[in-house]
């Protein structure tokens, strides 16, 4: 069968869209350092990039490869309110490089990490 | 010590405008989300209006949306609040509220003496 | 009318401990923080109890507050003659994007 070029452009603009790689996400602040419920980040999210995106196979996972530290600036407030909004600077893993990963990959270099 | 210092209030037909400014000291103004808060003679408080600490967040109460305008100038340690198209149910003691995280904490720890705002003919 | 209900009036004796109560929705009290202010006859209000159960510095502890599911209370223990004022709670409503406060309570 012959498709037309509109098809075959619309399908491959969905596979790069969708394939693996650094993509700009909302991190909720607290969450991401498991603070206390009585610290609050104010703005509560920061903008960073983390690996995301679909792999061709069901046994691949999409992982970073290298990974980037950007220092941002947010006001602090804690509970009791002893002092006001504070700035602190907190450092954020920014995924630079992304590769498909078998889950066992994925299970070795998580290991290796904790190892080491 | 913090102080919020408002002024600005007066007599104004119905249909006028007016603006009143609470000024800021004793803290760090640009730190803290800011909130209008007004009370009519013998009734409760109504929140009015509020604005994050960027200027980049505005909120008002449904009774004066398309009305009234929040605004700051962080430079100038200043909240502002400019109303049109006034009305009689305007009339009431206005309250500039510091507040230290808008719609988490929920919570107004300083605030000002009040400015009388009368619309009448 | 208020988003928030309050009783108009309490009342009590030099002592006696009173509770003052709030009512709301899970758009407001169930799913936000609560705060109290004291209004004194002709003065601007006062915080008392912010995030449902924390004292500023300066507040007694003869005052309390709690919140349960769409519920916040206000508890005033061993009672004095310079509380007699309007007690009002405020919190945020996320479906109304702003804040509300009750009609407040007078206490005598």
């Known amino acids: 069968a012959h498709y037309n070029t509109e098809i075959l452009k619309s399908i491959d603009n969905e596979w790069r869209k969708t394939q693996c790689m650094p993509r700009e996400v909302c991190i909720d602040v607290g969450k991401e350092f498991g603070v206390a419920t009585n610290t609050f980040f104010k703005p509560p999210c920061v903008s960073v990039y983390r690996c995301g995106g679909c792999c061709n196979s069901e046994g691949l996972q999409c992982m970073n490869t290298s990974t980037s530290y950007l220092s941002k600036t947010l006001f602090e407030i804690t509970v009791p309110l002893s002092q006001g909004p504070k700035p602190v600077t907190i450092s954020f893993a920014n995924h630079t490089s992304c590769r498909c990963m078998s889950k066992l990959d994925v299970y070795r270099q998580v290991h290796s990490i904790i190892r080491r | 010590e913090v102080q919020l210092l408002e002024s600005g209030g007066g007599l104004v037909q119905p249909g006028g405008s007016l603006r009143l400014s609470c000024a800021a000291s004793g803290f760090t103004f640009s730190s803290y989300d800011m909130s209008w808060v007004r009370q009519a003679p013998g009734k409760g408080l109504e929140w009015v209006s509020a604005?994050?600490?960027?200027?980049?967040?505005?909120y008002y109460a449904d009774s004066v949306k398309g009305r009234f305008t929040i605004s700051r100038d962080n430079s100038k340690n200043t909240l502002y609040l400019q109303m049109n198209s006034l009305r009689a149910e305007d009339t009431a003691v206005y309250y500039c509220?510091?507040?230290?995280?808008?719609?988490?904490?929920?919570?107004?720890?300083?605030w000002g003496q009040g400015t009388l705002v009368t619309v009448s003919s | 009318q208020s988003v928030l209900t309050q009783p108009p009036s309490a009342s009590g004796t030099p002592g006696q401990r009173v509770t003052i109560s709030c009512s709301g929705s899970?758009?407001?009290?169930?799913?936000?923080?609560v705060s109290w202010y004291q209004q004194l006859p002709g003065t601007a209000p006062k915080l008392l109890i912010y995030?449902?159960?924390h004292r500023p510095s300066g507040v007694p502890d003869r005052f309390s507050g709690s919140k349960s599911g769409t519920s916040a209370s206000l508890a005033i223990s061993g009672l004095r003659s310079e509380d007699e004022a309007d007690y009002y709670c405020?919190?945020?409503?996320?479906?109304?994007?702003?804040?509300?406060f009750g009609g407040g309570t007078k206490l005598t």
């Open positions: 604005i994050s600490y960027d200027n980049g967040s505005t």
């Open positions: 405020a919190t945020w409503d996320s479906s109304l994007n702003g804040y509300v």
């Open positions: 899970s758009s407001n009290i169930g799913s936000n923080n």
């Open positions: 509220a510091r507040d230290p995280y808008l719609a988490r904490l929920n919570t107004f720890d300083y």
């Open positions: 995030y449902n159960s």
